[in-house]
């Protein structure tokens, strides 16, 4: 492994559709894969009237947007489906939402970021 890179070998698995898909609902998924591909963990969830509903969690294959992310953090502002990915074993056990603030001219009333959601 390259020095400083956190190798992903397993991720927390969750599937809200587990009955239809005939899988277990939750567990640990081994992230097998091509040697020249990086492996990540991911989480997707929805915020339904302030309540967090996990959609899926598991392994995620070679995605440049996930490189070198040690924490699973969604940065998009108010998506319908929240998504985060990260590198490191079980790094998707906890996930959070920190929307990146748009860079605007400073005002007398600074905007505080929305609080994160954690699993």
């Amino acid at each position: 492994a390259i020095l400083g890179r956190s190798e992903t070998q397993e991720c927390l698995f969750f599937n809200a559709n587990w009955e239809k898909d005939r899988t277990n609902q939750t567990g640990v998924e081994p992230c097998y894969g091509d040697k020249d591909k990086r492996r990540h963990c991911f989480a997707t969830w929805k915020n339904i009237s302030g309540s967090i509903e996990i959609v899926k969690q598991g392994c995620w294959l070679d995605d440049i947007n996930c490189y070198d992310r040690t924490d699973c953090v969604e940065k998009k502002d108010s998506p319908e489906v929240y998504f985060c990915c990260c590198e490191g074993n079980m790094c998707n056990e906890k996930f959070s939402y920190f929307p990146e603030m748009e860079v605007t001219q400073p005002t007398s009333n600074p905007v505080t970021p929305k609080p994160p959601y954690y699993n």
Partner: antibody, heavy 120, light 107 residues
Framework: DVQLQESGPGLVKPSQSLSLTCSVT?????????WNWIRQFPGNKLEWMGY???????NYNPSLINRISITRDTSKNQFFLKLNSVTTEDTATYFC?????????????WGQGTLVTVSA | DIQMTQTTSSLSASLGDRVTISCRAS??????LNWYQQKPDGTVKLLIY???RLHSGVPSRFSGSGSGTDYSLTITNLEQEDIATYFC?????????FGGGTKLEIK
């Protein structure tokens, strides 16, 4: 990179079984991934048929469950499709394809496809 | 099963145009939507996954968007090599299902 190649007879008689092989290079089918068969009917409609996973477990399209079997030969790094009791409706181009993880279902690797005609 | 509908089966555009191809799912698929390109020789390639993420090696003129049941693929500055049929596919619930395809032709 992973490469897939389909092979098998191009013509099958009605009521007989259709058998195809997918040969995989660049990756061991027991090391990971889900190894799928997908077919494309005349007119372009694509249908996912089923998979065999790296650990040998199967999942099939309910529409085919009574006729389909997907098996493998790990020593040859191949997996197989067997479709029983075919009719002319099974005439299609058959692709093998793979995806990586249970909740990451993007078919990143495809074979070039093989046309199978069902005709007397 | 989740039905995937591409209402436009073929469309004509000029080189340099911006083209949008739509796909609708019969139920919410939570952004687990992929796009594929099939060239006239039958070769199939993954373009976009999870609604908007570009597969490695795919030109940046391809982009995807959508949520819930409605999704789209956009090609900006259409090139000759983009002439192909485009399929959407849902990866949210088994059995995995595909749209009927949209054939892109040059005017």
């Amino acid at each position: 990179d992973v490469q897939l190649q389909e092979s098998g007879p191009g013509l099958v008689k009605p009521s007989q079984s259709l058998s195809l092989t997918c040969s995989v290079t660049g990756y061991s089918i027991t090391s990971g991934y889900y190894w799928n068969w997908i077919r494309q009917f005349p007119g372009n409609k694509l249908e996912w048929m089923g998979y065999i996973s790296y650990d040998g477990s199967n999942n099939y399209n309910p529409s085919l469950i009574n006729r389909i079997s997907i098996t493998r030969d790990t020593s040859k790094n191949q997996f197989f499709l067997k479709l029983n009791s075919v009719t002319t409706e099974d005439t299609a181009t058959y692709f093998c394809a793979s995806y990586a993880y249970r909740n990451d279902v993007r078919f990143a690797y495809w074979g070039q496809g093989t046309l199978v005609t069902v005709s007397a | 099963d989740i039905q995937m509908t591409q209402t436009t089966s073929s469309l004509s555009a000029s080189l340099g145009d911006r083209v949008t191809i739509s796909c609708r799912a019969s139920q919410d698929i939570s952004n687990f939507l992929n796009w594929y390109q099939q060239k006239p020789d039958g070769t199939v390639k993954l373009l976009i996954y999870f609604t908007s993420r570009l597969h490695s090696g795919v030109p940046s003129r391809f982009s995807g968007s959508g949520s819930g049941t409605d999704y789209s693929l956009t090609i900006t500055n259409l090139e000759q090599e983009d002439i192909a049929t485009y399929f959407c596919q849902q990866g949210n619930t088994l059995p995995w299902t595909f749209g009927g395809g949209t054939k892109l032709e040059i005017k």
